[in-house]
């Protein structure tokens, strides 16, 4: 996801098919305010960025609105009038879905079903991770819709759950970003808890002298 050109490192993120963020690390232009110019159609004139991201008082990125029919971003990063990086990219490659919204849980004996509102576009996986204090690693389950049932749970144990959305590789390629995790929610005996005990770490073997 990072492109390089003339000392410029570029990162593109396409948030939820709504907002494109292009950021740069301009090592060769330490005190310059680079400007960002873009268009979504080759035949249009370039627009200049109106929402810049600033770092230490200097431009380091741009946020721009996109629509779902906008596929290709043509952009130019300039130092004054001199273009220092110019590119055109399929922006779907850089998709980052939004975090699961309206997350709810329903318990039935030794299983829990997590549901949330499906996002409005296709090609997504909804992943739930869970663990008890006896697990050192998160366990994972994912489905094509936000209706994920985790089975074989012990109702007496406290479980922490979190969820996220991922773009399917066969729809968007392998270089997308998963959403941020939802807040961790803890459950025991079908009721919410503020927290679960921390996972136990196995004791380190004592080294004989």
């Amino acid at each position: 996801q990072v492109a390089t050109g003339e000392g410029l490192q570029i990162q593109i993120m396409y948030f939820n098919l709504e907002t494109v963020q292009v950021t740069w690390n301009a090592s060769h232009y330490p005190r310059s305010n680079l400007s960002f110019h873009y268009k979504f159609s080759r035949d249009e004139a370039y627009d200049q960025c109106t929402v810049y991201i600033l770092q230490e008082g200097h431009t380091s990125g741009c946020l721009l609105d996109a629509e779902q029919q906008d596929d290709i971003l043509y952009f130019s990063i300039r130092n004054g009038t001199h273009p220092v990086f110019t590119a055109s990219r399929w922006i779907f490659y850089y998709l980052k879905p939004s975090s699961p919204k309206q997350v709810s849980f329903s318990w039935h004996q030794d299983a829990v079903t997590l549901t949330c509102s499906d996002l409005s576009y296709r090609g997504l996986l909804y992943e739930v991770q869970y663990r008890s204090p006896f697990d050192t690693e998160w366990q994972s389950k994912q489905e094509n819709t936000c209706n994920v049932t985790v089975e074989d749970l012990d109702a007496e144990k406290c479980y922490a759950f979190r969820a996220r959305v991922k773009a399917m590789e066969d729809a968007y390629g392998p270089d997308t970003y998963p959403s941020d995790w939802s807040e961790v929610t803890c459950w025991q005996r079908g009721e919410t808890r503020d927290s679960c005990p921390e996972p136990r770490t196995p004791p380190k073997p004592k080294l004989s002298k």
Epitope: Q1, A3, S88, F92, D170, A171, G173, P174, D175
Partner: antibody, heavy 122, light 107 residues
Framework: QVQLVESGGGLVKPGGSLRLSCAAS??????????WTWIRQFPGKGLEWMGY???????YYNPALKSRITISRDNAKNSLYLQMNSLRAEDTAVYYC??????????????WGQGTLVTVSS | EIVLTQSPDFQSVTPKEKVTITCRAS??????LHWYQQKPDQSPKLLIK???RSISGVPSRFSGSGSGTDFTLTINSLEAEDAATYYC?????????FGQGTKLEIK
């Protein structure tokens, strides 16, 4: 198993036009998510992507060719077409149609036709 | 557009040898780099997708690696039928572009 067969190649005079066809079998060109493309290969063996048409009829063209080409399709015939105008000698090439690998227009091409040779010469 | 440069342009190799072909992109493309094989008088055939993902039906002696700007196609234990021209192709940049090709000759 998708099979693609191009036709319509041959000798064309400079300044003339061509219309190439690509008949698909074993797979519907309207299958959701799939895009179809034209790619040409010059006598020196270099490959150039020309453009896509999607299951939704949306088209994308190589900026170097955009003003001279049109890609279209006929769902009833399960075929796609390449119309190219103002031909010049440097358009001499083998023209291939191909299918995108994924349910998306932006990836590798997993099925290719056998190609049709277009020679532009007076 | 993103320029892909392959090396070498030509390689003459004996059967059972290991062959490495490289492809360098003028801008970073993540892992969205694909490899094709074209035998004489045939159309190109997809060998490797997304830098390293294998394609059903392609012999396991073909493998790929790399990300960012530098990619490699490796053929382990070359066979006579591998005589062909090999092309890389990038997909995130618009327009999609191909490398100039590497011709592999079997001695």
């Amino acid at each position: 198993q998708v099979q693609l067969v191009e036709s319509g190649g041959g000798l064309v005079k400079p300044g003339g036009s061509l219309r190439l066809s690509c008949a698909a079998s074993g797979f519907s060109i309207t299958t959701s998510g799939y895009y179809w493309t034209w790619i040409r290969q010059f006598p020196g063996k270099g490959l150039e992507w020309m453009g896509y048409i999607g299951y939704n009829s949306k088209t994308y063209y190589n900026p170097a060719l955009k003003s001279r080409i049109t890609i279209s399709r006929d769902n009833a015939k399960n075929s796609l077409y390449l119309q190219m105008n103002s031909l010049r000698a440097e358009d001499t090439a083998v023209y291939y149609c191909a299918r995108s690998l994924y349910g998306g227009y932006k990836d590798a091409f997993d099925s290719w036709g056998q190609g049709t040779l277009v020679t532009v010469s007076s | 557009e993103i320029v892909l440069t392959q090396s070498p342009d030509f390689q003459s190799v004996t059967p059972k040898e290991k062959v490495t072909i490289t492809c360098r992109a003028s801008q970073s493309i993540g892992t969205s780099l694909h490899w094709y094989q074209q035998k004489p008088d045939q159309s190109p055939k997809l060998l490797i997708k997304f830098a390293s993902r294998s394609i059903s039906g392609v012999p396991s002696r073909f493998s790929g690696s790399g990300s960012g700007t530098d990619f490699t196609l490796t053929i382990n234990s070359l066979e006579a039928e591998d005589a062909a021209t090999y092309y890389c192709q990038q997909s995130p940049g618009f327009p999609p572009t191909f490398g100039q090709g590497t011709k592999l000759e079997i001695k």
